[in-house]
């Protein structure tokens, strides 16, 4: 009679993570008598996956009933496959022996490849806010995918970016892989509503790529422009001076009025108006009692935006002239000011 052969008909099997892998194995003879065992890998370091004779293997089930006397099908199913299960599986026939069974013949092996989806891309930006016209770096990371082939693209508001570098690790063979990409993005004053998107395409995603996003509102700081103007007189001895703070982001802003260098009032921007581009405008006004001043008054609007050093604009109020004669000076005189409050 011809000697027993162990046949593993599939050289390779590809399974998606989470699914069940079927590893086929048949013997050509019932002789010699003895159990079948499945191993991952070969040689002394091989890992036992299933032993027909003894042991507890909760993820493994047999395709046929191995207790039947004439059974020659030793195929198994491994449930809930993960990338860590990838490898070459060998079906090995043992001959009954005393005290131990002896390895008789091995199948040629079946390579199990696991297709694993990449994790949702995580996009992160710079540690501190940056001002418009600066180039900042964004990173995108995704992990746990297999096979290694993967495509990553960057977009800013739907426009594909070209200035980026991508690495897939590890370089050699592995059960799963990670991708890391860094893109350079130029900020503009209109970027408060902008988004940076990292898009990952992989064979496991069936043409439906995964996306990670970062809102540039978390990254950008748009410095305000200031304008101090004198409004028409409200009452005989009162002059209304306004400070218009325009086009700033984020909203965190504190304004201080100074009269001849002395603090008159401090307020925090609350009822701001939002521009179409996402930046804010705010106006503060100061009612100055001209009769309380003998000499000319230097009014300073000092703004501290988002923890940055205070910027200021000044306006000279001529007390010598009758308030009513001053009318509305739309072009405020911006004279020198020493308000620097640097941290």
């Amino acid at each position: 009679e011809e000697e027993l052969q162990v046949i593993q008909p599939d050289k390779s099997v590809l399974v998606a993570a989470g699914e069940t892998a079927t590893l086929r194995c048949t013997a050509t003879s019932l002789i010699p008598v003895g159990p079948i065992q499945w191993f991952r890998g070969a040689g002394p370091g091989r890992e036992l996956i299933y032993n027909q004779k003894e042991g507890h293997f909760p993820r493994v089930t047999t395709v046929s009933d191995l207790t039947k006397r004439n059974n020659m099908d030793f195929s198994i199913r491994i449930g809930n496959i993960t990338p860590a299960d990838a490898g070459t599986y060998y079906c090995v026939k043992f001959r009954k022996g005393s005290p131990d069974d002896v390895e008789f013949k091995s199948g040629a092996g079946t390579e199990l490849s696991v297709r694993a989806k990449p994790s949702a891309p995580v996009v992160s930006g710079p540690a501190a806010r940056a001002t418009p016209q600066h180039t900042v770096s964004f990173t995108c990371e995704s992990h746990g995918f297999s096979p290694r082939d993967i495509t990553l693209k960057w977009f800013k508001n739907g426009n594909e970016l070209s200035d980026f570098q991508t690495n897939v690790d590890p370089v050699g063979e592995s059960v799963s892989y990670s991708i890391h990409s860094t893109a350079k993005v130029v900020l503009t004053r209109e970027d408060v509503h902008s988004q940076v998107i990292c898009e990952v395409a992989h064979v496991t995603l069936q043409g439906d790529p995964l996306r990670g996003t970062a809102n540039l509102s978390e990254t950008i700081r748009v410095p305000p422009t200031l304008e101090v103007t004198q409004q028409p007189v409200r009452a005989e001895n009162q002059v209304n001076v306004t400070c218009q703070v325009r086009k700033f982001y984020p909203q965190r802003l504190q304004l201080t009025w100074l009269e001849n260098g002395n603090v008159s009032r401090t307020e925090t921007a609350s009822t701001v108006t939002e521009n179409k581009d996402g930046t804010y405008n705010w106006m503060s006004w100061l009612l100055v009692n001209v009769s309380a001043h003998r000499d000319d008054v230097k009014l300073t609007c000092q703004v501290e935006h988002d923890g940055q050093p205070a910027v200021s604009k000044s306006h000279d109020l001529k007390v010598s002239a009758h308030p009513k004669e001053q009318g509305s000076n739309t072009a405020a005189e911006n004279t020198g000011s020493n308000e620097r409050n640097i941290y």
Partner: antibody, heavy 119, light 107 residues
Framework: QVQLVQSGAEVKKPGSSVKVSCKAS????????IHWVRQAPGQGLEWMGD????????ANNQKFKGRVTITADESTSTAYMELSSLRSEDTAVYYC????????????WGQGTLVTVSS | DIQMTQSPSSLSASVGDRVTITCKAS??????VAWYQQKPGKAPKLLIY???SLETGVPSRFSGSGSGTDFTFTISSLQPEDIATYYC?????????FGGGTKVEIK
Amino acid sequence: QVQLVQSGAEVKKPGSSVKVSCKASGYTFTDYEIHWVRQAPGQGLEWMGDIHPGSGGTANNQKFKGRVTITADESTSTAYMELSSLRSEDTAVYYCARAVSGYYAMDYWGQGTLVTVSS
Amino acid sequence: DIQMTQSPSSLSASVGDRVTITCKASEDIYDRVAWYQQKPGKAPKLLIYGTASLETGVPSRFSGSGSGTDFTFTISSLQPEDIATYYCQQYWTTPWTFGGGTKVEIK
């Protein structure tokens, strides 16, 4: 007090690179940008670019067509400006200066580093 | 790039004179204009920022004004120590650009 101390004078051959350092002290390095400005002998001032060490954000003058690389090392509060593919026209004094972009101009300057490019 | 056209390129005035330097931007730069003083062999020194704000420690005889595209720098009473080259600079748009400079001399 705020100080920006630059590395010493350099003599370089055409085609080579130069890396000038600027060590900052007396303020929080990551809160301000470091700008680089150069001045050729007898000429005016020319802005080269800047870096914000806190955000890593950079801006460069496109005139230099990628020849300028500006970096910063937070651990030593030092900014660097590297200029590659040097030519004789790059002979100049190179200054670093501190600024808060969009809020202030360059309020503190380094002492300058003379770079001479000659064969 | 924004051009900053500074004039005059040089001037000679007497001690006590009022000196005015102008700078014209090729496009609107709001108030983001600075003025620097540079003495031979020295780094520039910031005098004025934000068009009209005087830098801390700078004498009040220096002042600035203007908006949009036209800016003026004034020394109300020229002193001997004011002999230097003065530069305007815009910091609204990168690349930041400087005027060509004005060399101020004493008659």
